[in-house]
Interface confidence: low
């Protein structure tokens, strides 16, 4: 099962994430694919050169998780559909994370750059949209999931770097995976979190329920 650590769509007020510089990402009310009102972040400085716009989440506690998954819903404007757009227009953005033992971030720390931030991946849209028609909803919503780990400190921040695109970050959900507590074949298996790597197998030792007796050695 998936255990959510943070879901931007549940925000009832402003998300209040940190942006750098102020002329970059902007928090606005938007809509999800079901036309529900949600808080989103948008940036569209395609006609300005040398863009390097960062957006940082609030501190996310890892709650014992070793591997973190990030689901992003976003839309990207098709660069070629913007008249006279410069060649620096982008249809991608970067995802980063930074581990910390407590909520220590400020306007200037961690530095807004790769290292100390750890790059997870460059995120590209499967579908970009060419016309903005909020009435007809031409905008295409993409969903991408990325994971990273192992994480070992109390928590982490995520950052989204735009370097010259026209995009809307519609929803961010951060979660980890675990096997729930189950009773099977007379044994109780406690809740077990997934391993640090995507392919990790974690052995879960069961214990007998009341009036049950172990008759065989568990398979290793």
């Amino acid at each position: 099962v998936e255990e959510t650590l943070m879901d931007s769509t549940t925000a009832t007020a402003e998300l209040g994430w940190m942006v750098h510089p102020p002329s970059g990402w902007e928090e606005v009310s938007g809509y999800d694919e079901n036309m529900n009102t949600i808080r989103t972040y948008q940036v569209c400085n395609v006609f300005e050169s040398s863009q390097n716009n960062w957006l940082r989440t609030k501190f996310i506690r890892r709650r014992g998780a070793h591997r973190i998954h990030v689901e992003m819903k976003f839309s990207v404007r098709d660069c070629s559909s913007i008249p006279s757009v410069p060649g620096s227009c982008k249809e991608t953005f970067n995802l980063y994370y930074y581990e910390a033992d407590f909520d220590s971030a400020t306007k200037t720390f961690p530095n807004w750059m790769e290292n100390p931030w750890v790059k997870v991946d460059t995120i590209a849209a499967d579908e970009s949209f060419s016309q903005v028609d909020l009435g007809g909803r031409v905008m295409k919503i993409n969903t991408e999931v990325r994971s990273f780990g192992p994480v070992s400190r109390s928590g982490f921040y995520l950052a989204f770097q735009d370097y010259g695109g026209c995009m809307s970050l519609i929803a961010v959900r951060v979660f980890y995976r675990k096997c729930p507590r189950i009773i099977q074949n007379g044994a109780i298996f406690q809740e077990t979190l997934s391993g640090a790597e995507s392919t990790s197998l974690v052995a879960a030792r069961g214990s007998c329920i009341a009036n049950a007796e172990e008759v065989d050695v568990p398979i290793k």
């Epitope: 098709d78 660069c79 559909s81 620096s88 991608t92």
Partner: antibody, heavy 119, light 113 residues
Amino acid sequence: QVQLQQSGAELAKPGASVKMSCKASGYTFTSYWMHWVKQRPGQGLEWIGFINPSTGYTDYNQKFKDKATLTVKSSNTAYMQLSRLTSEDSAVYYCTRRLKLLRYAMDYWGQGTTLTVSA
Amino acid sequence: DIVMTQSPSSLSVSAGEKVTMNCKSSQSLLNSGNQENYLAWYQQKPGQPPKLLIYGASTRESGVPDRFTGSGSGTDFTLTISSVQAEDLAVYYCQNDHSYPFTFGAGTKVEIK
């Protein structure tokens, strides 16, 4: 394999209009933008404009804005209509596809449609 | 519009010789975001449509012989044929793929002696 099959040669009178086609096969038509390029006899190449087949969005070289009209049909075919023809429009016209993000170039071209404008 | 200037306009070489042609753009074709140069080279043989040789200034298109090499950055670019063959008789065009309207150079015609 990828193919862009263009319609045959056209002979037209000054002032008339012509519509040429470019049928795509061997790839997902809506994943690439279709561009059109003009080449006059013994001359270089001139970019006319493009159409995004998934949305119908077009953008033109200002020089051809009142000359060319680009459209697409769901049958994997792109069209270019040239209006108010003059002898200056006599040329070979190529359709060519272009994918953004991976390659910044036009990787496959049609064989060309020759247009002759003559009274 | 970005103006692409190619030189020389033509050259005549013997099979096996090295050929170098230049392309200069009136504005930089370097994308600072991804450090890619949005420049392509095409080969056009008589009676045929252009064929993509090089994109991103230096990346050889699949199936293109390795005797063709693209180099350069910003505003100055070069296409080199290390050992020209008879089948390389063609006009070579560079293209600005950075800004609309896309523009092409006037071409360099390569003739084989």
